[in-house]
Amino acid sequence: APMKEANVHGQGNLAYPAVRTHGTLESVNGPRAGSRGLTTTSLADTFEHVIEELLDEDQKVRPNEENHKDADLYTSRVMLSSQVPLEPPLLFLLEEYKNYLDAANMSMRVRR
């Protein structure tokens, strides 16, 4: 299936903001009537964009984190790369998004 960039919005009850992903989603609001008409979605591409957007949002909210007294609130950080430290909330969002993509792919209609 041809890959194109789309805006994917999680359901209202999901704990992540609108993020970009590669892949075509005919239905982008979670499970509802007709939402099995999906084409391939990519976890790897999505993770890349999720990280970009969430880190971007994080910088907007806390541009001067180095000045915060609680900057070291999370002492153990998991590195996706040598440059990008991920705090637990971000790891949680990534896991949730992986779950969403697996669920969406499991809900795909088989096209003959």
Partner: antibody, heavy 115, light 107 residues
Framework: EVKVVESGGGLVQPGGSLRLSCATS????????MSWVRQPPGKALEWLGF??????????EYSSSVKGRFTISRDNSQSILYLQMNTLRAEDSATYYC??????WGQGTSVTVSS | DIQMTQSPASLSASVGETVTITCRAS??????LAWYQKKQGKSPHLLVY???TLADGVPSRFSGSASGTQYSLKIDSLQPEDFGSYYC?????????FGSGTKLEIK
């Protein structure tokens, strides 16, 4: 027409190995997640695991009951899904089903683990 | 892991009656739930997906609903071919566990 046909079941001794196959046709195999599910005699359905599609790197997930013993793989050139089962136990006796997403299921193949 | 608690385990009903089967998820599965019909010696047959969407070719007497973490399958005006076992399965975070099943028998 979408077709899903499992094969490879049979009688095997405890501790032995068996490889199940699931031959498919009628759809673009690489676009879809493929799953294995089993049902022991008189018991409920049990999800064993899946292998993701091409876009998601053909990565796998397993249930804790088979992780480390069972391996799901796929031959994308022939549109075949496999389930390699090692260190088989009596409790692995069941009918094994292969499924395309949740949509199409094969007729199942029976596995009996007994000495 | 998310557990699916299905009830009742068995159910006896007559042709023409309405029955409801429920599954409760131990966590939020965001409506990613399917219902299957399973007959002896046959493969599972998808009835409902995403909690309330009817699969292709499934009669309209079947319907799915959701309320919080509780999911229901209702069968109106039971037909002879509806008897068999029914299972729910969630698709939110692996493992994608099934409910324990409901055996629907003819009264």
């Amino acid at each position: 027409e979408v077709k899903v046909v499992e094969s490879g079941g049979g009688l095997v001794q405890p501790g032995g190995s068996l490889r199940l196959s699931c031959a498919t046709s009628g759809f673009t195999f690489t676009d879809y997640y493929m799953s294995w599910v089993r049902q022991p005699p008189g018991k409920a359905l049990e999800w064993l695991g899946f292998i993701r599609n091409k876009a998601n790197g053909y990565t796998t997930e397993y249930s804790s009951s088979v992780k480390g013993r069972f391996t799901i793989s796929r031959d994308n050139s022939q549109s075949i899904l496999y389930l390699q089962m090692n260190t088989l136990r009596a409790e692995d006796s069941a009918t094994y089903y292969c499924a395309i997403t949740m949509d199409y299921w094969g007729q199942g193949t029976s596995v009996t683990v007994s000495s | 892991d998310i557990q699916m608690t299905q009830s009742p385990a068995s159910l006896s009903a007559s042709v023409g009656e309405t029955v409801t089967i429920t599954c409760r998820a131990s966590g939020n599965i965001h409506n990613y739930l399917a219902w299957y019909q399973k007959k002896q010696g046959k493969s599972p047959h998808l009835l409902v997906y995403n909690a309330q969407t009817l699969a292709d070719g499934v009669p309209s007497r079947f319907s799915g609903s959701a309320s919080g973490t509780q999911y229901s399958l209702k069968i109106d005006s039971l037909q002879p071919e509806d008897f068999g076992s029914y299972y729910c399965q969630h698709f939110w975070s692996t493992p994608f566990t099934f409910g324990s099943g409901t055996k629907l028998e003819i009264k």
